[in-house]
């Protein structure tokens, strides 16, 4: 058993039929010695008396809020949560496996630049009685500070008869050095509590590996005289690291016809302009990627040829 926060404790249980469970001793936080009784949740049934209560925790029915009383007055509470281990593996019931980029990916994180600011998100089908707490650091043995905000519900999607909920959190490395080579990864730890179930999820990454620039901005077309060609121009996104001479992007320019089956013409360039043939009813799209490190491409910025 360990303390998650004040008066909230996590009991780690091997979860299998007829498992013996864990013996837990609760102590009433009071100077009183006599006349103390214990109850669980809203029940008025007295579970025991005395300053300590010894219980065998085997299942969710044994978890909950234990309260010690004296003469009708509440003295203190202890909330017991369960963390299930099945076949040696901690349960992952609360979050959905996003399966990207690989199986057992519960947390996904992205950064728009090298400032040390990043966003992580996760999915669940659970809509109520659910709390998240996020901690982060760079390195684990001698951790350097990363500050994370509160997790918030960022999207709700309908999947058949069920809804799926996306939560996200923003974190900022306290003393980020954008130009430095990373040697220790960022660690992100999410505590999830649904009713009386506790689970924890972790992700470890280098900022360079989770970079995904915003799409190029100010995408414009300039027709070239007496030609089917146009000059496409764009700018670095505002959120990208500066100076651009050091934090450079490379770009992919794509001409796509109205039909998805039509052949796509693609041009790769390090410049912020390119000349392409603009077909009728086609659209021109541009996306960006770090020039020197193959992390994710940005989403496309698009304009119609017409």
């Amino acid at each position: 058993i360990w303390e998650l926060k004040k008066d909230v404790y996590v009991v780690e249980l091997d979860w299998y039929p007829d498992a013996p469970g864990e013996m837990v001793v609760l102590t009433c936080d009071t100077p009183e010695e006599d006349g103390i009784t214990w109850t669980l949740d809203q029940s008025s049934e007295v579970l025991g008396s005395g300053k300590t209560l010894t219980i065998q925790v085997k299942e969710f029915g044994d978890a909950g809020q234990y309260t010690c009383h004296k003469g009708g007055e509440v003295l203190s509470h202890s909330l017991l949560l369960l963390h299930k281990k099945e076949d040696g593996i901690w349960s992952t019931d609360i979050l959905k496996d996003q399966k990207e980029p690989k199986n057992k990916t519960f947390l996904r994180c992205e950064a728009k630049n090298y400032s040390g600011r990043f966003t992580c998100w996760w999915l669940t089908t659970i809509s109520t009685d659910l709390t998240f707490s996020v901690k982060s650091s760079r390195g684990s043995s001698d951790p350097q500070g990363v500050t994370c905000g509160a997790a918030t519900l960022s999207a709700e999607r309908v999947r058949g008869d069920n809804k799926e909920y996306e939560y996200s959190v923003e974190c900022q490395e306290d003393s980020a050095c954008p130009a430095a080579e990373e040697s220790l990864p960022i660690e992100v730890m999410v505590d999830a509590v649904h009713k009386l179930k506790y689970e924890n999820y972790t992700s470890s990454f280098f900022i360079r590996d989770i970079i995904k620039p915003d799409p190029p901005k100010n995408l414009q077309l300039k027709p070239l005289k007496n030609s089917r060609q146009v000059e496409v121009s764009w700018e670095y996104p505002d959120t990208w690291s500066t100076p651009h001479s050091y934090f450079s992007l490379t770009f992919c320019v794509q001409v796509q016809g109205k039909s998805k089956r039509e052949k796509k013409d693609r041009v790769f360039t390090d410049k912020t302009s390119a000349t392409v043939i603009c077909r009728k009813n086609a659209s021109i799209s541009v996306r960006a990627q770090d020039r020197y490190y193959s992390s994710s491409w940005s989403e496309w910025a698009s304009v119609p040829c017409s």
Epitope: D41, T124, T128, D129, Y165
Partner: antibody
């Protein structure tokens, strides 16, 4: 205690509001649920309203009902009733432990008949 | 999400025992309650958290199970136990909520 009212005979498409009046406890501490039971059938949950006023509906509801509350009442509005909505409608109070809760205080029910 | 109750009807003698099963289509941990309903009356809570007896309910009623399989057992049957019994999942309103189809208990 909780008590439903407002059930009556209505023609299809006529909106109807059922009211659940509560006494002896505050709605700010409990989830409330509306459940219905067609004649000779089982219990079917319609939706709940949490202590903070958030509403959640069964997937089949699809905008056919809305739940709201005041300090002492919980309303179920039937937007455009059909004959399939003929049932006894129950209001019940949760235990107070959770939003998705079990229900330990039930009203006697109010009968809604939808017929032309 | 589905809660399947079996059997739909059961007949048993006074002082006998009845067992009703409730199966969830996904794990709901122990977030299951049982209700008794008599004709013309609202449901009455018997069991919550799969196995905890509601206040004032005789100990002849007991609940067990977790995950997807749950059981309500009524021992030492009395005529007053003739009713329809429903299980209810309250895991989450989106990811596992609702009532089973009901089991009618006839006491002979």
């Amino acid at each position: 205690s909780v008590e439903e009212s407002g059930g009556r005979l209505v023609t299809p498409g006529t909106p109807l509001t059922l009211t659940c009046a509560v006494s002896g406890f505050s709605l700010s501490g409990y989830t409330m649920i509306w459940v219905r039971q067609a004649p000779g059938e089982g219990l079917e949950w319609i939706g709940i309203i949490s202590s903070s006023g958030n509403t959640y509906y069964a997937s089949w509801v699809k905008g056919r009902f809305t739940i709201s509350k005041t300090s002492t009442t919980v309303d179920l509005k039937m937007i455009s009733p059909t004959t399939e909505d003929t049932a006894t409608y129950f209001c019940a109070r949760g235990s107070g432990a959770y939003i998705s809760d079990y229900f330990n205080v039930w009203g006697p029910g109010t009968l809604v008949t939808v017929s032309s | 999400f589905e809660l399947t109750q079996t059997p739909s009807s059961v007949e048993a003698a006074v002082e006998g025992t009845v067992t009703i099963k409730c199966q969830a289509s996904q794990s709901i941990d122990s977030w299951l309650s049982w209700y008794q309903q008599k004709p013309g009356q609202p449901p009455k809570l018997l069991i919550y958290s799969a196995s905890k007896l509601a206040p004032g309910v005789p100990s002849r009623f007991s609940g067990s199970g977790s995950g997807t399989q749950f059981t309500l057992t009524i021992g030492d049957l009395e005529c007053a136990d003739a009713a329809t019994y429903y299980c209810q999942s309250y895991y989450d309103v989106n990811a596992g909520y609702g009532f089973g189809g009901g089991t009618e208990v006839v006491v002979v």
